[in-house]
């Protein structure tokens, strides 16, 4: 069964800089990736980025740079919101649309006791929704 993993990481060099990493574990080719925060895409979340393998990427503030890391994983850098604890307790969701499997989505947030740059390697997260 395909799985989606989500990892939120605070950068060691800039404590106010955060990166969301997402990946798809499964067969098939990815046709679109959507990253949202505050909830799943289309279910209370606000879109941060859309990545298409051929047509490019689209990003919304406070996203700074969305990019493909591999053919099945992406990263999204976020600007500092200016809040005292930016992005803490915030849920980030990634939805991968793949052919022929359909859409798979999972969410994650910054671990409560995050040491900058010392996040654990990405591990699969339970799938929240499969369309």
């Amino acid at each position: 069964t395909p799985e989606v993993w989500v990892q939120v990481q605070m950068e060691a060099t800039e404590l106010s800089s955060f990166t969301v990493h997402c990946g798809f574990l499964g067969p098939g080719s990815i046709s679109l990736v959507t990253v949202s925060w505050g909830g799943p895409d289309g279910a209370g979340g606000t879109k941060l980025a859309v990545l298409h393998p051929e047509l490019g990427t689209r990003q919304w503030a406070p996203a700074r740079q969305a990019r493909w890391e591999t053919q099945s994983s992406i990263s999204l850098a976020l600007e500092d919101s200016g809040a005292s604890s930016p992005f803490a307790n915030t849920t980030f969701c990634c939805k991968f649309a793949s052919f022929p499997e359909g859409s798979w989505e999972s969410c994650g947030s910054l671990p409560p006791s995050s040491d900058p740059g010392l996040s654990a390697p990405p591990t699969p997260v339970p799938i929240l929704r499969a369309d």
Partner: antibody
Framework: EVQLQQSGAELVKPGASVKLSCTAS????????IHWVKRRPEQGLEWIGG????????LYASKFQDMATITADTSSSTAYMQLSSLTSGDTAVYYC????????????????WGQGTSVTVSS | DIVLTQSPASLVVSLGQRATISCRAS??????????MHWYQQKPGQPPKLLIY???NLESGVPARFSGSGSGTDFTLNIHPVEAEDAATYYC?????????FGGGTNLEIK
């Protein structure tokens, strides 16, 4: 200079369809979303839907899902909105608008608007 | 859908004074320090004009007498000092989720 030029006023009969156009200049239509907004006489603004011309992705308000079809032709930098099964309640000014884009990032707000197309539905 | 309620519906302000327009959302439109609320000005026969984006950011070319503030569900547009050319209808708009919705508008009259 960024501009959105909309097609001229339309007078249509109830039940008919109309296709409005919005031609962009001064920017690359593929760099942003194009939205459509309705304004009825003496009423406020209503978002109908939008399109990402680069990806072809469309979004609609559920209220307009069945009657509005938004498309775009990147070769002519033009977005279109077709409205079908028109009723008197669809008499309004329809605006196209560009989503604010700066340094490859979008901001959800609409920073440039067309002059509006007046649609009158009357028998 | 998120409902935006603007108040007052109409406002009369003397030249040089402060105009304050409020917009209340039926649920929070903020996430982690970012507020997805925008303000527009519309004059008769013209399309809307973006004034403020993301609650407090002044759009390029808009005079500094316009300012926006707020977070969560309560937002404010301030105009100070008001000038004669500011007579218009003002709308708030959220983009926290689909569909984006607009407030009912506030008609500002200058005396």
């Amino acid at each position: 200079e960024v501009q959105l030029q909309q097609s001229g006023a339309e007078l249509v009969k109830p039940g008919a369809s109309v296709k409005l156009s919005c031609t962009a200049s001064g920017f690359n239509i593929e760099d942003t979303y194009i939205h459509w907004v309705k304004r009825r006489p003496e009423q406020g603004l209503e978002w109908i839907g939008g399109i990402d011309p680069a990806i072809g992705n469309t979004l609609y308000a559920s209220k307009f899902q069945d009657m509005a079809t938004i498309t775009a032709d990147t070769s002519s930098s033009t977005a279109y909105m077709q409205l079908s099964s028109l009723t008197s309640g669809d008499t309004a000014v329809y605006y196209c608008a560009r989503e604010r884009v700066y340094s490859n990032t979008l901001y959800y707000a609409m920073d440039y608007w067309g002059q509006g197309t007046s649609v009158t539905v009357s028998s | 859908d998120i409902v935006l309620t603007q108040s007052p519906a109409s406002l009369v302000v003397s030249l040089g004074q402060r105009a304050t327009i409020s917009c209340r959302a039926s649920k929070s439109v903020s996430i982690s320090g970012y507020s997805y609320m925008h303000w527009y000005q519309q004059k008769p026969g013209q399309p809307p004009k973006l004034l403020i984006y993301l609650a407090s950011n002044l759009e390029s070319g808009v005079p500094a007498r316009f300012s926006g503030s707020g977070s969560g569900t309560d937002f404010t547009l301030n105009i100070h000092p008001v000038e004669a050319e500011d007579a218009a209808t003002y709308y708030c708009q959220h983009s926290r989720e689909l569909p984006p919705t607009f407030g009912g508008g506030t008609n500002l009259e200058i005396k």
